[in-house]
Amino acid sequence: FPQDRPFEDTCHGNPSHYYDKAVRRCCYRCPMGLFPTQQCPQRPTDCRKQCEPDYYLDEADRCTACVTCSRDDLVEKTPCAWNSSRVCECRPGMFCSTSAVNSCARCFFHSVCPAGMIVKFPGTAQKNTVCEPASPGVSPACASPENCKEPSSGTIPQAKPTPVSPATSSASTMPVRGGTRLAQEAASKLTRAPDSPSSVGRPSSDPGLSPTQPCPEGSGDCRKQCEPDYYLDEAGRCTACVSCSRDDLVEKTPCAWNSSRTCECRPGMICATSATNSCARCVPYPICAAETVTKPQDMAEKDTTFEAPPLGTQPDCNPTPENGEAPASTSPTQSLLVDSQASKTLPIPTSAPVALSSTGK
């Protein structure tokens, strides 16, 4: 590399720097115990402490415990990363009534719209179901959902939501309008109000009735009803919701009358090959940084130069590609960006390169 010599020479004799031929730059060598936050660190601030598993480095440079989503009514929204906490949200079918930092202190079941009311906005993890009065006198042969309802005026009533106390978050019997919590859950499923951001702000309602049946008195919604585990697609066809039954998948949003169930890789895994509303192949998170330094001569006793943290403790792996590296494709679920297809130990396919930030954040 004769053309690089002048640059390389500027690094020599300075133990705090090294020359990286791949990026043709002098880089700052992070001191022992600190780890680089980019491929070619330029200054001490590009080196950070590595926290223990399930801890993250906060803005004050302190190792802080990631919140836990272990309560029955919570699910993990984003994993614990080296520089950000895990984020929890209420599980599908519930919304947050009392928020907490990176989590929710109190989740309630989505309201079930009472008789004579229909769902105006489905419940989400953050908001309860919004109901509106059903428009009377609508023809049973509705050409489209829009023709099935008229704009309503006045207040928008909401059924009283059902709280789930963290202390009693198992399926115990809690009275809900003469029923139990299980009855409430069953009713929630009947309204099929999805916990799907895609349906927020879109008028929707109960699944409706088959067009062969007359509209019941007072019903403002006569759309085609699909079989259970099917949804009405944009072309008006009943389409099967994807299944999240594979061991490596979890349900992200439920099957709703107008949108498919969506699946994502379970915590600790990342999507290598995306699929519509799901992931075709999940792989364990790569170890993005290591924990304990061991000398090369210790390699005989230890299997690695470094003792690495368990899988999933360093999940947000967004690399800066090296020369000639092709990052992997992104996916709707958490996606891993790597240089190229990994070996059998971590098989991750690739596609066209993607521009990435160099900070790893």
Partner: nanobody, 123 residues
Framework: EVQLVESGGGLVQPGGSLRLSCAAS????????MGWFRQAPGKGLEWVSR????????YYADSVKGRFTISRDNSKNTLYLQMNSLRAEDTAVYYC????????????????WGQGTLVTVSS
Amino acid sequence: EVQLVESGGGLVQPGGSLRLSCAASGYIYSSNCMGWFRQAPGKGLEWVSRIHTGSGSTYYADSVKGRFTISRDNSKNTLYLQMNSLRAEDTAVYYCAAGRVVLGAVVCTNEYWGQGTLVTVSS
């Protein structure tokens, strides 16, 4: 003084195989990542493969996928690159590099480099 010394290069016919070795000596402090780069005559440096020694995860450039295999022998402090089904375009000087995995990423720093070993694929 850290040293990475490559060996195993040479002349091989197309379709043939070679195994490159990279012996690490000295104290490569904090290193948890080793890899191979190559530079063909008149071309720039090209990343070939990498192994994260903490997780054992291995990565390959598209151009070598399915033909090259990276591995390590901890007891010998040695990194290997098994090259099969060699092609004329694999002709290059192959360099071994060692560094650290970047926090929150799957790329590595390249803090230490070997002097390289020449691989020539020709009939």
